[in-house]
């Protein structure tokens, strides 16, 4: 007998063909011999089956000797053997209906697990293979689980159900709720304005929740809540904000914070958490602030950085257009009795300049020790 696979909620068309290319009498029955539908002349007649309101045929095809059974809004329990009686012949078609659903919401937080459950008719032994948007294949039987969802798992999952050498394909859209970046570093000279941005990696029509930014300053012994806020239909409203620093937060997405100036006491790292309505768990993004200061006191020219720098970063002091006078993998460097001219303090990673601060050293005959800063913006 012919096997047809169907998807829960979909429409299936079971074919039945007579040798005569004209409209003749036909009946469709289920395995219990209960009539589903048939014809009486050019009229469609229906029997007392459970499919009554969901069964149909195509009258336009009857004249060609085709008498299909169309079943709409398929249910797992529609799986059965359907018999078409035409011209004293019986054509049997076995319909197997499968359903594949995410057993939780399809909007999941990064790091959570996704479980896909296959609904199948009794007696069937299907196999399932799913391909994630990043090309990862997973196989299973009645259930498939993916732990520790990542941002790249967002998108359409394509799952193939195989039964009796036939296959049916399901597409499930999964949204992984996360920030675009897990971590970011902002490099600033002392006194410069600081902007932190926390773009989300997903878009939803209505976004509601609450969030907080905790800050651990390098100089402080404990972390401090800098700001708490609510999110209602994508509108940000600040609930509580620290007085030092004087933070401002934008009222629309992406989440955005500004500090009027970078100061050594603010250098450190923060953790922004966002709890979304009707979701367990929180979204996290780490943000780091590195602050540079170049100063001249008496005969000592010093450059310092504060904040979370990697040990491989190089801090250098050099006179403009000359070789570096001092270059160390440390957070402070200095030059004694510096020559007059424009000095540059550079924080670099493998030759790439991350942060630069310029300071002018005046000739000592001018009274010595006087100085001023020049800020070059990148």
């Amino acid at each position: 007998k012919k096997v047809v696979l169907g998807k829960k909620g979909d429409t299936v068309e079971l074919t039945c063909t007579a040798s005569q290319k004209k409209s003749i009498q036909f009946h469709w029955k289920n395995s219990n011999q209960i009539k589903i539908l048939g014809n009486q002349g050019s009229f469609l007649t229906k029997g007392p089956s459970k499919l009554n309101d969901r069964a149909d045929s195509r009258r336009s095809l009857w004249d060609q000797g085709n008498f299909p059974l169309i079943i709409k809004n398929l249910k797992i329990e529609d799986s059965d053997t359907y018999i078409c009686e035409v011209e004293d012949q019986k054509e049997e078609v076995q319909l197997l209906v499968f359903g594949l659903t995410a057993n939780s919401d399809t909007h999941l937080l990064q790091g959570q697990s996704l479980t896909l459950t296959l609904e199948s008719p009794p007696g069937s032994s299907p196999s399932v293979q799913c391909r994630s948007p990043r090309g990862k294949n997973i196989q299973g039987g009645k259930t498939l689980s993916v732990s520790q969802l990542e941002l790249q798992d967002s998108g359409t999952w394509t799952c193939t159900v195989l039964q009796n050498q036939k296959k049916v394909e399901f597409k499930i859209d999964i949204v992984v709720l996360a920030f675009q970046k897990a971590s970011s570093i902002v490099y600033k000279k002392e006194g410069e304005q600081v902007e932190f941005s926390f773009p989300l990696a997903f878009t939803v029509e209505k976004l509601t929740g609450s969030g907080e930014l905790w800050w651990q300053a390098e100089r402080a012994s404990s972390s401090k809540s800098w700001i708490t806020f609510d999110l209602k239909n994508k509108e940000v409203s600040v609930k509580r904000v620290t007085q030092d620093p004087k933070l401002q937060m934008g009222k629309k997405l992406p989440l955005h914070l500004t500090l009027p100036q970078a100061l050594p006491q603010y250098a450190g790292s923060g953790n922004l958490t966002l709890a979304l309505e009707a979701k367990t768990g929180k979204l996290h993004q780490e943000v780091n602030l590195v602050v540079m200061r170049a100063t001249q006191l008496q005969k000592n020219l010093t450059c310092e950085v504060w904040g979370p720098t990697s040990p491989k970063l190089m801090l250098s002091l050099k006179l403009e257009n000359k070789e570096a006078k001092v270059s160390k993998r440390e957070k402070a460097v200095w030059v004694l009795n510096p020559e007059a001219g424009m000095w540059q303090c550079l924080l670099s990673d493998s030759g790439q300049v991350l942060l630069e601060s310029n300071i002018k050293v005046l000739p000592t005959w001018g009274g010595g020790g006087s100085h001023h800063h020049h800020h070059h913006h990148h």
Partner: antibody, heavy 119, light 107 residues
Amino acid sequence: EVELLESGGGLVQPGGSLRLSCAASGLTFSTFAMSWVRQAPGKGLEWVSGISGSGENTYYADSVKGRFTITSDNSKNTLYLQMNSLRAEDTAVYYCAKEGYNWNYMDVWGKGTTVTVSS
Amino acid sequence: AIQMTQSPSSLSASVGDRVTITCRASHGIRNDLGWYQQKPGKAPKVLIYEASSLQSGVPSRFSGSRSGTDFTLTISSLQPEDFATYYCLQDYTYPYTFGQGTKLEIK
């Protein structure tokens, strides 16, 4: 076409109260944030108060905080500004303005209503 | 509150001139700034939103730009109907704040 029409202005003594209304037509009121902006005679524009589309969040300029209250009635498509403890420096033309989708900018303004606080 | 410093406060120019007005924000405000034109006895009208987007129906001689916390409104070739007062408005966060205004007069 979206239209905003302010009313309720007039002459009031210092310490008195007034309620301004802003009737909106041609829009789904609850979708948009709204603001009140004022302009004292011969002076620049000053933002006074704002309300989110849902009506849940309200905001005020420091100069009016504790004295003015912004509310909206979505069923009447009307924005209100209740002004108490009025001072001479509150004398101004008061405009109501609708914000664009996603709170981008004030894209529609009313013609304004004049409030004079004087004894 | 975020301060908006607008300059110049007044400006004399002739038809056909290129004119620029600037606003500086005391904090970073992304692109969350609009430019508004107001004529005597009338309500303000938006020209530019989100720092550089031209409002529908506004002539293309108006343009806006941003550099950090500095915002500029440029009128490429002044027309007689452009003589008015111009304001910037930050809508980054509440309380919103306007610049002091720039009165553009005929020379």
